[in-house]
Every structure is written in C-alpha cells, then in structure tokens.
C-alpha cells in the first residue's frame, strides 16, 4: 500500500504552503498568523472577548491564497507537517467568525483489491472464532505481522511506556491494509463467547494504551487538540461519523466512519471495546467533576458510546467479516474491495 | 535608514480638501502597513486611519469615515490621504507611521509631521 | 472602542529618582492563545514626533536604554526609568492595538523636579 504522493492529492497543503513561502506577503501573513497562537487549540468564542487586529489581518491576506482549502491524507509522507499547515490555515478561515472543525482529510477512495489467502486457515480448528481467524489472516501477511508485532513489544510487559505503545499502534492502523487491520479490530463474536469478545477487547492492548486511571473526558479533548494529529483525528471521527437519525445513517459513508474510528487508535482519544460480551465501544474517561461542562462533556462521550452511525458501521462490517468465512468461495484466494462496505 | 517625509500641509477653509503624502525610504515599502496619525495642537495622538502593504484592507477612524481617503502607491514607495469636507477639529499635526508588521500593530517609525489647519 | 486611561497627567520627578506611569484600558489587551499583551510606550519630546520605546507590553525597542521598562498584562500597565536623566523629559504615551481602532491614551508629562 504505497503512500500517497503530494501530487495525488488535489490541493496538498505543503504543495500550498511551498506557493505561499514564493510569495512574500502570503509567507510573511502565514508566519504571522502563525505567532497569533501559542498552541494549536483555537479557543472558543466564550473564552475569548475578540481575536487581535493584526491577527484578523493577517488572516484576511491568506484568505485568498491557495493555503485555504488545502488538504492532507491519513496515510502521506510528512503528514503531520501538512496537518501543522493545515490548522495555521484553519485559523485563517475561522478568525472572527468561529466555525466549526473541519475534517483536513482529502477522501480519496481506494477500488484496489486485497487479496487474502484463506488457504493457510486450514491450520485452524475448524470451530475457531473469527477473531483468532483474522489474528491468522495478518499473521500470515508479512506487512501485518510485522506491524502488529511492533506493536506488541511495544505494548507488552509489566513497565510498558504508554507514549511509545500509542506510537506503535498508530502506526499499525496506518500503515497495515485497511482490511487486515478492520478484520483484526472489528472481528465478530459469538454472543456467548467471552474468549472471543476478551481477544477483541485486548486487540489494541489497552492496560498499556489506556490511561490507569480515566482522565475527565473534555481534559482528554483538550489534551487532544494540543497535537495537530490527534486533533486532526479527532474532526476527522466527528465528520464523518456524525449521525444523522437514530437508524444509523451516517453523514458520509459508512467505511468512511470505520476509517476514522480506527484513525483515533493510538491516539490521546483512543477508544474501545467496553467489554467482552458486546460490542459497544467507549473512550477511557469520565464526566466526573465537568462542572457546568457535564452536558458538553457528556455530548463528547457520547459521541463514542451512544453514536448509532458507528454503532451500525461496525455492525455492517462485522457481519461483512462474518460472510467472509461463511461462504464457499471459489478460490482459496479472493479480493476485498476496499470500498465494499460503502452505503 | 527609515526616513518619512510627510507633504502637503498647509491653511484651508472649512469645507475644503487637502491631499497629504508621505515619502517613504529605507526599507520595502510594499510589505509594510502604513497609517496616518494625528495630534491636535497641545493634544494627545489619535489614529486616522490604516492601509495594508498590497493596499487591499483599509480601516479609518469613525471621525473620519466617509470624508478621507487613504491610498498608496508601491511603485513610488509613497503614502497618501486625500481629505475632503475638512473640519475645524481636523486641525493637528499629520503623521505618517511604519507599522512594525504588515497588519495594524503598532508604530516604530513615524515621519516628522505636516500641520493641516482648517478655519471656519 | 478600548479606552486607555494613563496617570498621572504629569510628574515631577529628581535626576537619578525612578518615574513610574501607569496605564489602564477599559478591556483586558492580552490574548491568552498567545499570550501576548497587546500594548505600547511611546516618548514624544516638544517639536519632535513619538518614538517607539516599548511594546509587547515589556520587551524594549533596541537602541532604548534599559533604564526603560515596561510591565503588567491584561488592563494594568507600567512604564518605568529607574534613574530618570535630563534627557528623558517629555510626554509618554500608551497605546493598544489589540483592536482597531488602536488607541492612545491622553499622555503623561515627565519634568525634573
């Protein structure tokens, strides 16, 4: 799965940015707006009376420069320099009149074929859960394994360092195929299977990628968007899993959600499974001691527990994985689309 | 060295217009903010009105809005403020100021001044 | 508009003694995502136009002596020469610019006792 180049994406913001260093006053504007902020959160309007002048003039000489509207991708060289980029810019766009996050993600969908070779499964007894068969499926695919491996050092032991286990597992859930690392995440369970539903829960090895004690979750938040990646990531999940009824529909697609929910993994917002019986997923934090913050704080844990678009997205995708190895393919070997599961 | 060179002062009729300029040198005059500043005889100082270094933003003080004009032109590295319908209170001392930035902070150079006096 | 309000309206101050200025805006000139407070100094000797001393609230214009220095954050600001010399008689001035338009405040007199 080769990175994705800046040229393949429509309007790279480090493309953007090299344009605006040529010009000087776009890249002395860029410089500027950029010592408007001390850290990349962009205080909301109940914390700030008003933005500076010279804040709001910097920003209205970016506003027609090539850096508004520029993009990057989850899986490109130099990603979290085009992220740094990307929220100097947003404040451009959102001085003076606050809006909200946007995604700095370009959709760029992928039609190339996995192939997965389900011959070695054999192995396997036959009465195997699904999530030991996907566990199989990367151990069998030397990218994945490797990846996964990785992340396992990293994360094991009784004195594992979280920062460097989170680390690792950012990586895996960029740069593993899509579907090694959905299959390995959101493997489907018997109802009564407490080994299965135990072996999903510790995919992600959350005794040393969660916190040991649960932060407050608006604290988490605001830990979060002090780093352009996690920030990022974060917008990213709310974009695109932002529910729009109570049957589940998503504002995007459904794998759209699935990608940014797995994008979250490794980060100050990783989430999980709550336990081993169901498939409701959480974030490590409380609402406790919010203050007259509950209701926000509320809404953002929400977000993760009560979302029924990500609740029926990895529904959809765990009775995909489920089809999987319940019909007679043909071959042994046979293709996913990645974009099987759109809706 | 900066230097600012401010021209065109002089005694009008209330009523009247006056266009003043601003000679610049010393440094580039098209990445820097430009404003006018003024002070009455015996006053304190009170901003006019300000111009970006392209010259796209403009803003001017609510005393003056509608009656002057700020403007420049980069290749004659030179400032102007065309006041028209002058006033007997615009009479002061006119000062053309450097912005340190390009975006309306504060003043680090500042011409030596051209008076405006406007009588009734 | 942010009101700048300065005291006292003059000072009379021995060779050698400290001359403190204060100055107060009508709303907090700090914004805290950068924390910066959004305030000047300047000195205008008589005939002469203001020159730049301070700005940033605290950090010192270069060529200024460093008998001048500026202090406070939000609505409280200090000018002060810790050992005023002949030189330094003239009117200060503060001003913000955090918002436009920018303003000054009304000026304080600084003479030799």
């Known amino acids: 799965d080769p990175l994705p180049t800046e040229s393949r994406l429509m309007n790279s913001c480090l493309q953007a940015r090299r344009k605006c260093q040529a010009d000087p006053t776009c890249s002395a504007a860029y410089h500027h707006l950029d010592s408007c902020t001390s850290s990349i959160s962009t205080p909301l309007p109940s914390e700030e009376p008003s933005v500076p002048a010279d804040c709001l003039e910097a920003a209205q000489q970016l506003r027609n420069s090539s850096l508004i509207g520029c993009m990057c991708h989850r899986r490109m060289k130099n990603q979290v320099a085009c992220l740094d980029i990307y929220w100097t810019v947003h404040r451009a766009r959102s001085l003076g009149n606050y809006e909200l996050d946007v995604s700095p993600y370009e959709d760029t969908v992928t039609s190339k074929p996995w192939k997965m070779n389900l011959s070695k499964l054999n192995m396997l007894k036959p009465d195997s859960d699904l999530c030991l068969k996907f566990a199989m499926l990367c151990t069998l695919n030397d990218k994945c394994d490797r990846l996964r491996k990785a992340y396992g050092e990293a994360c094991s032991g009784p004195h594992c360092q979280r920062h460097v286990c989170l680390r690792q597992l950012l990586t895996f859930f960029e740069k593993a195929a899509e579907p090694h690392a959905q299959g390995l995440l959101l493997c489907p369970c018997a109802p009564n299977d407490r080994g299965c539903g135990e072996r999903r829960r510790n995919t992600i090895a959350p005794n040393c990628a969660l916190p040991p004690v649960a932060p407050n979750c608006l604290e988490l938040r605001r830990l979060c968007f002090s780093d352009p990646l996690c920030r990022s990531r974060l917008v990213d999940f709310q974009t695109h899993c932002h529910p729009m009824d109570i049957l589940g529909t998503c504002a995007t697609e459904q794998s759209r959600c699935l990608r940014a929910y797995l994008g979250l993994i490794g980060t100050a917002m990783t989430p999980n499974f709550v336990s081993n019986v169901n498939t409701s997923v959480a974030l490590s934090c409380t609402c406790r001691g919010s203050g007259n913050l509950q209701e926000e704080c509320e809404m953002l844990e929400g977000f993760f527990s009560h979302n029924p678009c990500l609740t029926e997205a990895i529904a959809a995708k765990m009775r995909f994985h489920s089809q999987l190895f319940s019909q007679d393919w043909p071959h042994p070997t046979f293709a996913v689309m990645a974009h099987q599961n759109e809706n | 060295e900066v230097q600012l060179l401010e021209s065109g002062g002089g005694l009008v009729q209330s009523g009247g217009s006056l266009r003043l300029s601003c000679a610049a040198s010393g440094f580039s005059f098209n990445n820097y903010a430009m404003s006018w500043v003024r002070q009455a005889p015996g006053k304190g100082l009170e901003w006019v009105s300000f111009?970006?270094?392209?010259?796209?933003?403009?803003y001017y003080a609510d005393s003056v809005k509608g009656r002057f004009t700020i403007s420049r032109d980069n290749s004659k590295n030179t400032l102007y403020l065309q006041m028209n319908s002058l006033r007997v209170e615009d009479t002061a001392v006119f000062y053309c100021?450097?912005?340190?930035?390009?975006?309306?902070?504060?003043?680090?150079?500042w011409g030596q001044g051209t008076l405006v006096t406007v009588s009734s | 508009d942010i009101v700048m309000t300065q005291s006292p309206d003059s000072l009379a101050v021995s060779l050698g003694e400290r001359a403190t200025i204060n100055c107060k805006s009508s709303q907090s000139v700090l914004y805290s995502s950068n924390n910066k407070n959004y305030l000047t100094w300047y000195q205008q000797k008589p005939g002469q136009p203001p020159k730049l001393l301070i700005y940033?609230?605290?950090t010192r214009e270069s060529g200024v002596p460093d008998r001048f220095s500026g202090s406070g954050s939000g609505t409280d600001f200090t000018l002060t020469i810790s050992s005023l010399q002949a030189e330094d008689v003239a009117v200060y001035y503060c001003?913000?610019?955090?918002?436009?338009?920018?303003?000054f405040g009304l000026g304080t007199k600084v003479e030799i006792k």
């Open positions: 940033w609230a605290s």
């Open positions: 111009i970006s270094g392209s010259g796209g933003s403009t």
């Open positions: 100021a450097k912005d340190r930035y390009n975006y309306g902070t504060f003043f680090d150079y």
């Open positions: 001003q913000q610019y955090y918002s436009t338009p920018p303003t």
